[in-house]
């Protein structure tokens, strides 16, 4: 789970060790702040939970790509 170190900065200290299907993901944001110990991706899931993930993992990259495409493809 991400931790807010102040009102403006949220950091991840641990990553999920279990892949989550992209069907269970709603959105994501990247954490790149120098105030955080590591770069991270925070996924928001379909049940509104935020989960920290390792941006180096293939499934995380694939999921971000998929979510990006979803945003680019408007629903009819």
């Amino acid at each position: 789970q991400p931790d807010a170190i102040n009102a403006a900065v949220t950091c991840c200290y641990n990553f999920t060790n279990r892949k989550i299907s992209v069907q269970r993901l709603a959105s994501y944001r990247r954490i790149t702040s120098s105030k955080c110990p590591k770069e991270a991706v925070i996924f928001k899931t379909i049940v509104a939970k935020e989960i920290c993930a390792d941006p180096k993992q293939k499934w995380v990259q694939d999921s971000m790509d998929h979510l990006d495409k979803q945003i680019q493809t408007p629903k009819p």
């Epitope: 892949k19 299907s21 269970r24 899931t45 049940v47």
Partner: antibody, heavy 119, light 109 residues
Framework: QVQLVQSGAEVKKPGSSVKVSCKAS????????ISWVRQAPGQGLEWMGG????????NYAQKFQGRVTITADESTSTAYMELSSLRSEDTAVYYC????????????WGQGTLVTVSS | EIVLTQSPATLSLSPGERATLSCRAS???????LAWYQQKPGQAPRLLIY???DRAEGVPARFSGSGSGTDFTLTISSLEPEDFAVYYC??????????FGQGTKVEIK
Amino acid sequence: QVQLVQSGAEVKKPGSSVKVSCKASGGTFSHYGISWVRQAPGQGLEWMGGVIPIFHTANYAQKFQGRVTITADESTSTAYMELSSLRSEDTAVYYCARYDAHYGELDFWGQGTLVTVSS
Amino acid sequence: EIVLTQSPATLSLSPGERATLSCRASQHVSDAYLAWYQQKPGQAPRLLIYDASDRAEGVPARFSGSGSGTDFTLTISSLEPEDFAVYYCHQYIHLHSFTFGQGTKVEIK
């Protein structure tokens, strides 16, 4: 430790309805779902449907669509399964089981409720 | 709807022997979202394996799962007397449409 406690056995007449409850304790209801699975005597497991309480909507197996209603009350951490227009083939043990909505495997199960449909 | 077909229907083995149970899906099971359960008479099912190959908490190491795509296997390396039961596979790709296999009974020879 998560526990799912179901209501007691029921004997029902054909054509009537039954409502089975499943109370969860020892864990959060927030990002979990409850599935209902039935098992007729000597038969296998059959998924009936499920609900993720924070969504307030349920999903049903096609076979039971229109005859089953699954609901959940977040305030009491209780899920319900109501089956209508009962027939003898609905005689079975009905189980509730919990799953994490991020995944889906059924990690905790209720003890089962025997529903007997007989005239 | 994804149909899961388990084989064999019954497996007759002796304690100490290796049991290999198969579960075949009618469609690709993405993310290996497949679980295995054990059920003994008069009891609720118990989760053994999730995500095709991860052992649930408290499950002995003699139980292992493998496979991907449409073919999955549950292996019990050396049967203990308490392992004689019925085993079910379950796919959970779509939260709105779970399905189970019809079960494999592991009985004492």
